[in-house]
């Protein structure tokens, strides 16, 4: 806390300038009004303040606003948003999407900090849900933006925010996300031909069911492996062997090289070897010929 | 991103000069502040002189004045601080910053 005195003769500030980076902390305290800087905050962020001296400007601005400030400051506090603490955040309504553009811009090329996290949420919370806009200006700030959210808070994202969604978005996404925003996909891509439709909804299959992977199969799709081994495996589980070989098309001479991981190696072991032996492959593991496969939990279910 | 390499520090003599250089990338200067600062062990950062990158007003510390000058070449977007008449008291790490960005800083140390 700085001490409260007065303001030397002659320093009183008449504008936020570079002159005010030479004034020791009291200075800063005693000199410069609130606010004329709640007024100049977009020249802080050109002068280099340092870590001491932005403390007290942040302590000007708490006290001007004691119940948090207005956005028309917060959409130009630059790095002085650095120090703020979520718990300052929480304060805010931030409605304008310029402001929140303005506050990651400070915040790009390092890690969702605590505070960046908070004013997200503020601002998805303050507009409903999370609009297209929205979500191409978070994942462009950072990718991992949707994989971060919960499914609940997912299923408020609408099918037309999935346009503004790209592959790179999905890669730390798990099945329980997947299996949210694919129908979300499939309802925003449902207009377009097959060979389009695919390439939009590759990214979101490890969310598909069964028949939505069979439905593909007859599609001449040539899904690639990498793609394969993020289904679901309750999903794979069920496909032939004829189905698999037209969904994978070329690539399925890749099941080789993955035999021994989910979901090929649990696929394989509901196989019959026979049919597997088509495939010209090498796949072992299947079912011997002769072996009547009974699927118990149909029959749990039936008694 | 900015990027801000100061360079040119070393161990000088009471009374003799220096020249520390601060190049920067990443970005063009127009709308920044540069300044150079300093920071003696145990002591706050202090602002040392800056200049300003568009109007080019030039500003020094008390404690340097008619001893230090700052300037600055456009074309190879480099900060210059040349620091006569050293004294043991200046002894410090010197950091050149630019709006919002530092640098790592120099070490120059004046003694006999």
């Known amino acids: 806390e700085v001490e409260k005195t007065a303001c030397p003769s002659g320093k009183k500030a008449r504008e936020i300038d570079e002159s005010l980076i030479f004034y020791k902390k009291w200075e800063l305290e005693a000199c410069v009004d609130a606010a004329l800087l709640a007024t100049q905050m977009d020249r802080v962020n050109a002068i280099p303040f340092t870590y001491e001296q932005l403390d007290v400007l942040k302590h000007k601005l708490d006290e001007l606003y004691p119940q948090g400030y207005p956005e028309s400051v917060i959409q130009h506090l630059g790095y002085l948003f650095l120090k703020m603490s979520p718990e300052d955040i929480r304060k805010w309504n931030v409605t304008s999407l310029e402001t929140l553009k303005a506050l990651l811009e400070v915040n790009k090329g390092h890690e969702m900090s605590p505070q960046v996290a908070t004013l997200i949420d503020r601002f998805v919370k303050g507009r409903g849900q999370l609009d297209k806009d929205t979500l191409d200006t978070l994942t462009a700030f950072y990718p991992g933006y949707l994989c971060s959210l919960s499914p609940e808070e997912l299923s408020s994202v609408p099918p037309s925010s999935i346009w503004a969604v790209r592959p790179q978005d999905l890669d730390t996404c798990d099945p329980r996300q997947l299996d949210v925003l694919y129908p979300k996909a499939r309802l925003a891509f449902q207009n377009m031909n097959g060979s389009e439709y695919f390439v939009k909804i590759q990214s979101f299959l490890g969310g598909a069911p069964t028949e939505d992977l069979k439905a593909l199969s007859q599609q001449n799709v040539s899904m690639d492996l990498a793609t394969f081994m993020k289904l679901r495996t309750d999903a794979v589980l069920p496909l032939t062997v004829a189905e698999v070989q037209k969904l994978l098309g070329p690539h399925v001479e890749g099941l080789k090289a993955e035999e021994r991981h989910r979901p090929v190696r649990d696929w394989i072991l509901r196989q019959r070897q026979d049919d597997l032996d088509t495939l010209g492959l090498g796949l072992q593991g299947g079912i011997p010929n002769g072996y009547l496969v009974l699927d118990l939990s149909m029959q749990e279910a039936l008694s | 991103q900015v990027q801000l390499v100061e360079s040119g520090g070393g161990l000088v003599q009471p009374g003799g000069s220096l020249r520390l250089s601060c190049v920067v990338s990443?970005?063009?200067?127009?709308?920044?502040?540069m300044a150079w600062f300093r920071q003696a062990p145990g002591k706050e950062r202090e602002a040392v002189a800056s200049i300003n990158w568009s109007s080019g007003r030039l500003i020094y510390a008390d404690f340097v004045k008619g001893r230090f000058t700052i300037s600055r070449d456009n074309s190879k977007n480099t900060l210059y601080l040349q620091m006569n008449s050293l004294r043991p008291e200046d002894t410090a790490v010197y950091y050149c910053a630019a709006g919002r960005y530092w640098g790592q800083g120099t070490q120059v140390t004046v003694s006999s």
């Open positions: 990443g970005r063009t200067l127009e709308s920044y502040v």
